[in-house]
């Protein structure tokens, strides 16, 4: 007969590890007992458990409550055991010694490998502002055994750099994602992807990019000057800008206070029925935490009668 086992048994931290040991015997052969021990190099053998056909499964005090037989079916020639709730310290060499009748004793070794799945963390870099050069957008760190793989998934153009730190039983990998901030990146996802043999699927942590910027301001509403005449109702000026964080708006008049009846509503300046008093230079002041912008326009309220008189004069002059 011969012993069947595995060279390496791989288990995820916290799971139960099945340590296989099966005696492939000839007809009529029987297994009397199976002894399991840990046999790491440089240390004496440490008994785990003894499976005896008559006296049952005896577990050594150091492994009490952690070594059991696997669930059925169990073959009388199968000396496999379960090591419950595997921890990193369980990683190492194990030996099963099988006493058979009438063939004698056999032994085999296996290596237990305990995978420690990573718990990744993503840390955003400093606040991103348009106009900066190459800037850290985020760093992603994952520690596990063996070392995890850390990559990035994004539509955003950037560069990555990784570094690794080895610990006694694990390794920490940190990857950084750098980019040149631009407003087009706002709201774009930047995803850290961590791969590891102890994970059923990749772990993903997504960070949404926020780039501070403030666009140039402009004022709309004066496209047709002929509409700005005495008596017109519903005239308004609208300040156009965009930014992150969203900007606030403030209206002033350069050559004096805002005329009475002029109403400010955020980015919009609303006028009552126009009079010549409304002529002047108006300033839209746009600001956010990142920057501020100004845009000014000149409003010239026309007097239709003056205009028609001038036209008559021109006609008569000709």
């Amino acid at each position: 007969g011969e012993l069947e086992t595995s060279d390496v048994v791989t288990v995820v931290l916290g799971q139960d590890a099945k340590l296989p040991c099966f005696y492939r015997g000839d007809s009529g052969e029987q297994v009397g007992q199976v002894a399991w021990a840990r046999v790491d190099a440089g240390e004496g053998a440490q008994e785990l458990a003894l499976l005896h056909s008559k006296y049952g499964l005896h577990v050594s005090p150091a492994y009490e409550g952690r070594v059991e037989q696997p669930p059925p079916p169990r073959n009388p020639l199968d000396g496999s055991v379960l090591l419950r709730n595997a921890v990193q310290a369980d990683e190492g060499e194990y030996e099963c010694r099988v006493s058979t009748f009438p063939a004698g004793s056999f032994q085999a070794r296996l290596r237990l490998r305990v995978l420690v799945p990573p718990l990744p963390s993503l840390n955003p870099g400093p606040a991103l502002e348009e106009g900066q050069g190459l800037t850290l957008a985020a760093s992603c760190t994952a520690e596990g055994s063996p070392a995890p793989s850390v990559t990035w998934d994004t539509e955003v153009k950037g560069t990555t750099s990784s570094r690794s730190f080895k610990h006694s039983r694990s390794a920490a990998v940190t990857s950084e994602f750098h980019l040149v901030p631009s407003r087009s990146m706002n709201g774009q996802p930047l995803t850290c992807v961590v791969s590891h043999p102890g994970l059923l699927q990749d772990q993903r942590i997504t960070h949404i990019l926020h780039v501070s910027f403030l666009a140039e301001a402009s004022v709309r509403g004066l496209e047709d000057q002929n509409l700005w005449h005495i008596g017109r109702e519903g005239a308004m000026l609208k300040c156009l800008s965009e930014g992150q964080p969203p900007p606030s708006y403030n209206w002033t008049r350069l050559d004096g206070p805002l005329p009475s009846g002029v109403r400010v509503d955020g980015d919009t300046l609303g006028f009552p029925p126009l009079t010549t008093e409304h002529s002047g230079i108006y300033v839209c002041h746009v600001s956010n935490e990142f920057s501020s912008r100004d845009s000014q326009v000149t409003v010239d309220v026309l007097d239709p009668q003056e205009d028609s008189g001038k036209q008559v004069d021109l006609v008569s002059a000709s």
Partner: antibody, heavy 119, light 107 residues
Framework: EVQLVESGGGLVKPGGSLRLSCAAS????????MNWVRQAPGKGLEWVSS????????YYADSVRGRFTISRDNAKNSLYLQMNSLRAEDTAVYYC????????????WGQGTLVTVSS | DIQLTQSPSFLSASVGDRVTITCRAS??????LAWYQQKPGKAPKLLIY???TLQSGVPSRFSGSGSGTEFTLTISSLQPEDFATYYC?????????FGQGTKVEIK
């Protein structure tokens, strides 16, 4: 002598509870998977529940799952079956049995204890 | 769950007869089957495990065979103390299940 002795049976009303005990002698209980089997009057054997040697794995028949709890105290060399929400159909002789190492067949049985559920 | 069906349910035989009891499993259980003997008012007693291995102390007139879904228990020469009820049990997977039993009576 290797033996198992059950106790705790008796008459109980429907909806009531009982706790059966099984004391092992002549061997170390913590070396074996342990089981409960029942037999209704004039009927065949019905497997009820099993617990692994270290107590880490417990198994139940569908007919008792959620109502019965198997447990063991290896220090006291004892096995237990906590039976709640008892029904008339739980009336039976309850046996504890030892699961043999290597193949699981029930090699040692207790003499049984009768549980009668009736109003 | 795995169902076990024993046949016959009742069997009348005489001392010295060769008796065969069959146990059929609803699905493949390899060789993971045990046979028990039970006498009235007594606990069951293990006769055979993994289909064909005789439990220590059990007389050699008892034998078991089969694998997969079809198993048999044979008593080569029935003795007076063998009149009892016999049960098969699958120990392939939980929930463990028993056959309904075969009662061997004196003819």
């Amino acid at each position: 002598e290797v033996q198992l002795v059950e106790s705790g049976g008796g008459l109980v009303k429907p909806g009531g509870s009982l706790r059966l005990s099984c004391a092992a002698s002549g061997f170390n209980l913590n070396h074996y998977n342990m089981n409960w089997v029942r037999q209704a009057p004039g009927k065949g054997l019905e497997w009820v529940s099993s617990v692994s040697s270290g107590g880490g794995f417990r198994y139940y028949a569908d007919s008792v799952r959620g109502r019965f709890t198997i447990s063991r105290d290896n220090a006291k060399n004892s096995l237990y079956l906590q039976m709640n929400s008892l029904r008339a159909e739980d009336t039976a002789v309850y046996y504890c049995a030892r699961g043999a190492v290597f193949h699981d067949a029930f090699d040692i049985w207790g003499q049984g204890t009768l549980v009668t559920v009736s109003s | 769950d795995i169902q076990l069906t024993q046949s016959p349910s009742f069997l009348s035989a005489s001392v010295g007869d060769r008796v065969t009891i069959t146990c059929r499993a609803s699905q493949d259980i390899s060789s993971y089957l045990a046979w028990y003997q039970q006498k009235p008012g007594k606990a069951p007693k293990l006769l055979i495990y993994v289909a064909s291995t005789l439990q220590s102390g059990v007389p050699s007139r008892f034998s078991g065979s089969g694998s997969g879904t079809e198993f048999t228990l044979t008593i080569s020469s029935l003795q007076p103390e063998d009149f009892a009820t016999y049960y098969c049990q699958q120990i392939n997977s939980y929930p463990f299940t028993f056959g309904q039993g075969t009662k061997v009576e004196i003819k």
